[in-house]
């Protein structure tokens, strides 16, 4: 499935913690690009092997 | 997926207006956000809140202090409670399935009218 | 809370027409802008979401537009069983909120 990517509505500006929230369109669900240093499903978590 | 609302069709004013949806041919764990809305007499369309496939809820700040979502995973069933119910709460109460910005499966509805 | 107007309630057209219903927000949605269907028995059905995307099994006959605050969901060639009533949602801010509905009826 090749899903679109938007930003964010305003309801989920916060949703991640250390990165930008994208909005997949299709599947009407929110995602995360995580900033350096960051992983999770929510750029939760620091990336000890960064 | 289907949705299936049942409960009560008659409350009293000021007592507790409950309601099931029970879903089938989707686990409501499993992902998006199980919602009520209400339809006034008239047409109007009310989000009342939701619950989502991880338990937690969100609720519209018009009926914070009214009501209550909850599940019963076992039965992939999801309850509204609605507190001290006066006649403005008499609606037409949907189940619906949604994301995080719309309603893509909604139950069939069940009227509700609140009078002594 | 965003307030969403249908100014229209109500709408009449001939089968085969082309028609336009309009929804507006009391303020930038973002395209986050969805259209739903009610047939007469209660039905509800979602049409049309993220402004103009057409949901699944929904006919082409369907379409939407819209940015900021003013959208509009177009039905052309209609058909019988197109006779429901229409309703925008804004899913940009929670609470999410609802237009009133605009009905259509036959000539």
């Known amino acids: 499935v090749v899903s679109h990517f938007n930003d964010c509505p305003d309801s989920h500006t916060q949703f991640c913690f250390h990165g930008t929230c994208r909005f997949l369109v299709q599947e009407d669900k929110p995602a995360c690009v995580c900033a350096s240093g960051y992983v999770g499903a929510r750029c939760e978590h620091a990336d000890l092997l960064a | 997926v289907q949705l299936q609302e049942s409960g009560p069709g008659l409350v009293k004013p000021s007592q507790s207006l409950s309601l099931t949806c029970t879903v089938t041919?989707?686990?409501?764990?499993?992902?998006?956000?199980w919602n009520w809305i209400r339809q006034f007499p008239g047409n109007k369309l009310e989000w009342m809140g939701y619950?989502?496939?991880?338990?937690?809820?969100s609720y519209n700040p018009s009926l914070k202090s009214r009501i209550s979502i909850t599940r019963d995973t076992s039965k992939n069933q999801f309850f509204l409670q609605l507190n001290s119910v006066t006649t403005e709460d008499t609606a037409t109460y949907y189940c619906?399935?949604?994301?995080?910005?719309?309603?893509?499966?909604w139950g069939q509805g069940t009227l509700v009218t609140v009078s002594a | 809370d965003i307030q969403m107007t249908q100014t229209t309630s109500s709408l009449s057209a001939s089968l085969g027409d082309r028609l336009t219903i309009s929804c507006r927000a009391s303020?930038?949605?973002?395209?986050?802008l969805n259209w739903y269907q009610q047939k007469p028995d209660g039905t509800v059905k979602l049409l049309i979401y993220?402004?103009?995307r057409l949901h699944s099994g929904v006919p082409s006959r369907f379409s939407g537009s819209g940015s900021g605050t003013d959208y509009s969901l177009t039905i052309s060639n209609l058909e019988q069983e197109d006779i429901a009533t229409y309703f925008c949602?804004?899913?940009?801010?929670?609470?999410?909120?609802f237009g009133g509905g605009t009905k259509l009826e036959i000539k």
């Open positions: 619906a399935r949604g994301g995080i910005t719309r309603f893509a499966y």
């Open positions: 619950i989502s496939y991880s338990g937690s809820t």
């Open positions: 041919g989707y686990s409501i764990t499993s992902d998006y956000a």
């Open positions: 993220y402004t103009s």
């Open positions: 303020q930038d949605i973002r395209n986050y």
């Open positions: 949602q804004q899913g940009n801010t929670l609470p999410w909120t």
